[in-house]
């Protein structure tokens, strides 16, 4: 018996087609992805093959103005239109709190939404009961298939799930649910979830009875053969894990941003064992036409976005200096504003010992692309912010050793004075440079804001300590020459859309007046 699994993950609000790098589509003839193009390919496969499931492994939420404006209603609407069979909850589905998940998505989705390791307690338990499920069994042709969901247990540190949801260890939570499916005589089981490739592989290895793992969160690109675009494969598709009980378990992921449609064919024997698995992600490029009816619907929904981008978010009473003459040479107040917004967006009261789980921010000055003039009545719009942060990136959470941070700050000024983009703007950090010293030895003082304290204060960076830092995904991926971050990071979790972080902060503060306050000094 053969099953075709079509899968997406980490789509992050890319409802419209995008450029090859998943930013805003500029040249339509070379654009990729988007729900209209995805629908064309899905329908083509549904018509050609008998047993097809369309699955999403989480993080539909967050990433473009679509989410900022529609807050998840767009996800439910277009996933319903594409007739998804199931979705697993990702960490970003909690970005607007539990209410921001329940109302627009859980109550409106016509497909099951899954997570076995999220347990509701307190007053939320009855409110959310049945709106998401640990597993779902679906009839597919003349067989039944069980799909069991999971979500990153780090979600409380990455999003805003509140205090009434407990995120359990994925493997511990999955096993009893898979066992339950076995008692229902369901012998073909897919684990669909959002915890990252390393956890996906562990699930394949450790959870008895799971036949296939469809994952997300780590934006992993797997491919067998010559890859069709710029993404470099992290391994073959599917990635085969040998389970502790000796089975070969295929593990798949489909990069991110709706650029690819994962396509996996699984052959089962009559006892539900996987006999063979093969496939590849399908690049959704312009050779695949956009479905006209979905495209028309997208255009209809777009109207509200255009109106939103010119509305006032808040006011500034000072000039927001985002000029390259400032931000690539010295502390600039636009950099301070952005870093403050980044930290504010990551406020999660961890426990009594910590005032927050993260206190530091770094931001490449070259990523700040425009100032904002306060003399236009002080008005700040989404459109203004899009000029400052035009790349559609995210502000991510990483864990780094102090020694890696020190290298990053040395890199920040290794060729100072050439207006290059690697000069770092900061938050929760005090740095002093001595440019008279040779490159690689210019950082003379590096103090960081404590987190394990009731009154935050600055202490010297410790080389062997592990620190959490908020930074642009561009830096996490080694951009602007920050190879040491990419090579040495200990953990990387993708965060919220950059413009959204800053716009939310400005809306919250209403009036802003960021200063240059001695975060970066030269001796």
């Amino acid at each position: 018996w053969e099953l075709t699994i079509l899968h997406t993950n980490d789509v992050h609000s890319r409802l419209e087609q995008t450029s090859e790098d998943s930013s805003k589509c500029v040249n339509a003839s070379r654009c990729m992805g988007g729900v209209a193009r995805l629908f064309t390919k899905v329908q083509q496969i549904r018509r050609a093959e008998p047993n097809v499931l369309l699955l999403d492994a989480g993080d539909q939420y967050q990433g473009t103005i679509w989410f900022t404006v529609y807050k998840g209603a767009e996800v439910a609407h277009f996933m319903n239109a594409l007739r998804y069979d199931a979705m697993a909850l990702g960490n970003h589905e909690f970005d607007n709190g539990v209410e921001g998940l329940i109302e627009p998505l859980l109550k409106e989705a016509k497909f099951p939404i899954l997570s076995a390791n999220i347990k509701a307690k307190g007053p939320l338990a009855s409110q959310i009961s049945g709106l998401y499920l640990p597993y779902k069994v679906l009839p597919v042709g003349d067989e039944v298939v069980g799909i069991v969901g999971y979500t990153s247990k780090e979600t409380p540190f990455l999003s805003n799930p509140g205090t009434n949801l407990v995120f359990e260890d994925e493997i511990t939570a999955l096993q009893p649910e898979v066992d339950k499916l076995k008692t229902l005589n369901v012998n073909k089981i897919i684990a669909l979830g959002h915890s990252g490739f390393e956890t996906d592989k562990l699930i394949a290895q450790k959870v008895r009875g799971v036949d296939v793992v469809v994952g997300g969160h780590s934006n992993t690109f797997l491919y067998t053969g010559n890859p069709p675009s710029k993404e470099v494969p992290a391994g073959k598709y599917p990635f085969i894990v040998t389970s502790d009980d000796g089975r070969k378990v295929p593990v798949v992921q489909a990069y991110a941003f709706g650029k690819y449609l994962g396509y996996l064919k699984i052959e089962f024997d009559e006892r539900g064992n996987v006999i063979s698995s093969h496939g590849n992600p399908i690049l959704l490029n312009s050779s695949i036409p956009e479905d006209p009816s979905i495209k028309a619907d997208i255009n209809k929904w777009r109207i509200k976005l255009d109106n939103y981008s010119t509305q006032e978010l808040g006011k500034t009473i000072v000039y927001l200096d985002g000029s390259s003459q400032s931000c690539r040479f010295r502390e600039c107040n636009m950099g301070n504003l952005i870093c403050d917004a980044m930290i504010n967006n990551n406020l999660r009261h961890a426990d009594e010992m910590f005032w927050n789980h993260v206190s530091m921010c770094i931001l490449n000055g070259g990523g700040i692309r425009s100032p904002i003039d306060e003399r236009n009545n002080g008005t700040i719009t989404w459109e203004n912010l899009a000029a400052v942060l035009p790349f559609g990136g995210t502000f991510d959470l990483v864990q780094l050793k102090g020694s890696t941070l020190k290298k990053a700050f040395e890199h920040s000024v290794h060729r100072y004075g050439q207006s290059t983009g690697e000069f770092l703007q900061v938050g929760g950090i005090h740095v002093v440079y001595d440019l008279s010293r040779k490159p690689g030895d210019r950082v003379v003082k590096l103090d960081v804001l404590c987190t394990k304290c009731r009154v935050p204060s600055y202490d010297p960076l410790k080389m062997d300590e592990i620190y959490k830092v908020i930074l642009p995904n561009f830096l996490a991926n080694g951009g602007d020459g920050f190879q040491m971050i990419k090579d040495e990071l200990l953990r990387h979790d993708s965060g919220d859309q950059d413009i959204n972080v800053v716009s939310t902060y400005i809306s919250k503060m209403k009036v802003i007046y960021p200063a240059v306050e001695g975060r970066i000094k030269f001796s």
Epitope: G130, P139, D142, E143
Partner: antibody
Framework: QVQLQQSGAGLVKPGASVKLSCKAS????????MHWVKQRPGQGLEWIGM????????NNNEKFKNKATLTVDKSSNTAYMQLSSLTSEDSAVYYC????????????????WGQGTSVTVSS | DIVMTQSQKFMSTTVGDRVSITCKAS??????VAWYQQKPGQSPKLLIY???DRYTGVPDRLTGSGSGTDFTLTISNVQSEDLADYFC??????????FGSGTKLVIQ
């Protein structure tokens, strides 16, 4: 038209087994799941399990796991349910019913039912 | 397991009236509910699926509504042939199906 013809009523002794049949006509037997449902006198309906004639794949209500065995004979378009170790609790009318599903969101329902087979367990 | 509760065992009505039969699920089942009619001495017949979709040939006097945990089968302009037992069924927990205990419609 679609018809599900069930075998006649039966009187069986406690501890014995009985095999009920359900012959399908008017549609492609191997395209639809077949379900079995129990109804005790004056009581509600209780779902027993289902089988797909094409693959022979079965799913049972845990309660009936050791009680009911579902099989099919594709050549005669017939579904069978064997009930074993019968007690008075098993005295009931048993229905076979065709399962249809489709659409979006996925809907499932039992659209055609047999006339029922009455089983009486008595010594 | 999901329990479907039909709290009214009997409902009395008269010809031409409108009657509502209710069914409550023990947890959210979305719209994964079907309704069946069983006349005396007959096998059940499908009336409604997906909580509100009328099955082929079912008169539009019969209407299903509800979602989540509360579901209603409404019969308007009740006729003598509507005398029957009515059962709700949830299929949210597929492959486990559970039926309500039934409501007998009595026509005075």
């Amino acid at each position: 038209q679609v018809q599900l013809q069930q075998s006649g009523a039966g009187l069986v002794k406690p501890g014995a087994s009985v095999k009920l049949s359900c012959k399908a006509s008017g549609y492609t037997f191997t395209n639809y799941w077949m379900h079995w449902v129990k109804q005790r006198p004056g009581q509600g309906l209780e779902w027993i399990g289902m089988i797909h004639p094409n693959s022979g794949s079965t799913n049972n209500n845990e309660k009936f796991k050791n009680k009911a065995t579902l099989t099919v004979d594709k050549s005669s378009n017939t579904a069978y349910m064997q009930l074993s170790s019968l007690t008075s609790e098993d005295s009931a009318v048993y229905y076979c019913a065709r399962f249809f599903f489709g659409g979006y969101p996925h809907y499932y329902a039992l659209d055609y039912w047999g006339q029922g087979t009455s089983v009486t367990v008595s010594s | 397991d999901i329990v479907m509760t039909q709290s009214q065992k009997f409902m009395s009505t008269t010809v031409g009236d409108r009657v509502s039969i209710t069914c409550k699920a023990s947890q959210n089942v979305g719209t994964a509910v079907a309704w069946y009619q069983q006349k005396p001495g007959q096998s059940p017949k499908l009336l409604i699926y997906s909580a509100s979709d009328r099955y082929t040939g079912v008169p539009d006097r019969l209407t299903g509504s509800g979602s989540g945990t509360d579901f209603t089968l409404t019969i308007s302009n009740v006729q003598s042939e509507d005398l029957a037992d009515y059962f709700c069924q949830q299929y949210s927990s597929f492959p486990l199906f559970t039926f309500g205990s039934g409501t007998k419609l009595v026509i005075q």
